[in-house]
């Protein structure tokens, strides 16, 4: 879930399931002010989903958005 009231978006929990990669439009990382590290995926339907940056699928999605294998 996201802290919607604050200017800084933080992840308090992470998605428990892998999002299909073709649903992902973009991502951003949470602030160092947050208590937990996080990656927030923005879906093509404009949903924001918190994901655990220590999970391999999250890392791969970020690489695929930014870089090429």
């Amino acid at each position: 879930s996201l802290a919607a009231d604050t200017p800084t978006a933080c992840c308090f929990s992470y998605t428990s399931r892998q999002i299909p990669q073709n649903f992902i439009a973009d991502y951003f990382e949470t602030s160092s002010q947050c208590s937990k590290p996080g990656v927030i995926f923005l879906t093509k339907r404009s949903r924001q989903v918190c994901a655990d940056p220590s999970e391999e699928w999250v890392q791969k999605y970020v690489s695929d958005l930014e870089l090429s294998a």
């Epitope: 990382e29 160092s32 590290p37 996080g38 940056p53 220590s54 391999e56 890392q59 294998a69």
Partner: nanobody, 113 residues
Framework: EVQLVESGGGLVQAGGSLRLSCAAS????????MHWYRQAPGEQRELVAG???????SYADSVKGRFTISRDNAKNTVYLQMNGLKPEDTAVYYC???????WGQGTQVTVSS
């Protein structure tokens, strides 16, 4: 608190090589993807290479085939081997841990023609 210290930069002629190192503390980096970024004067910071916790690597098109990212989990360190350097590779190079909004001081790479 996550701390990152980059080193290994310097002045090198075009076609030369450098190996950058990034030592991390305050975190077990083996769990996370590590990325190398660079920022040239007047330009935006750009991601050049990444390595996942599982060892999968990926690169920006501009450095593919010339740069190699690797990691030593026992040393909490990530490396960037840069071969065939070009003047356009001149920049300050930074490493970053995915999910942690922390940056080191960077290391300057200057490639002369």
């Amino acid at each position: 608190e996550v701390q990152l210290v980059e080193s290994g930069g310097g002045l090198v002629q075009a076609g030369g090589s450098l190996r950058l190192s990034c030592a991390a503390s305050g975190i077990i980096t083996s769990r996370y993807a590590m990325h190398w970024y660079r920022q040239a004067p007047g330009e935006q910071r750009e991601l050049v290479a990444g390595i996942t916790s599982g060892g999968s690597t990926s690169y920006a098109d501009s450095v593919k085939g010339r740069f190699t990212i690797s990691r030593d989990n026992a040393k909490n360190t990530v490396y960037l081997q840069m071969n065939g350097l070009k003047p356009e590779d001149t920049a300050v190079y930074y490493c970053k841990v995915l999910g942690f909004d922390r940056w080191g001081q960077g290391t300057q790479v200057t490639v002369s023609s």
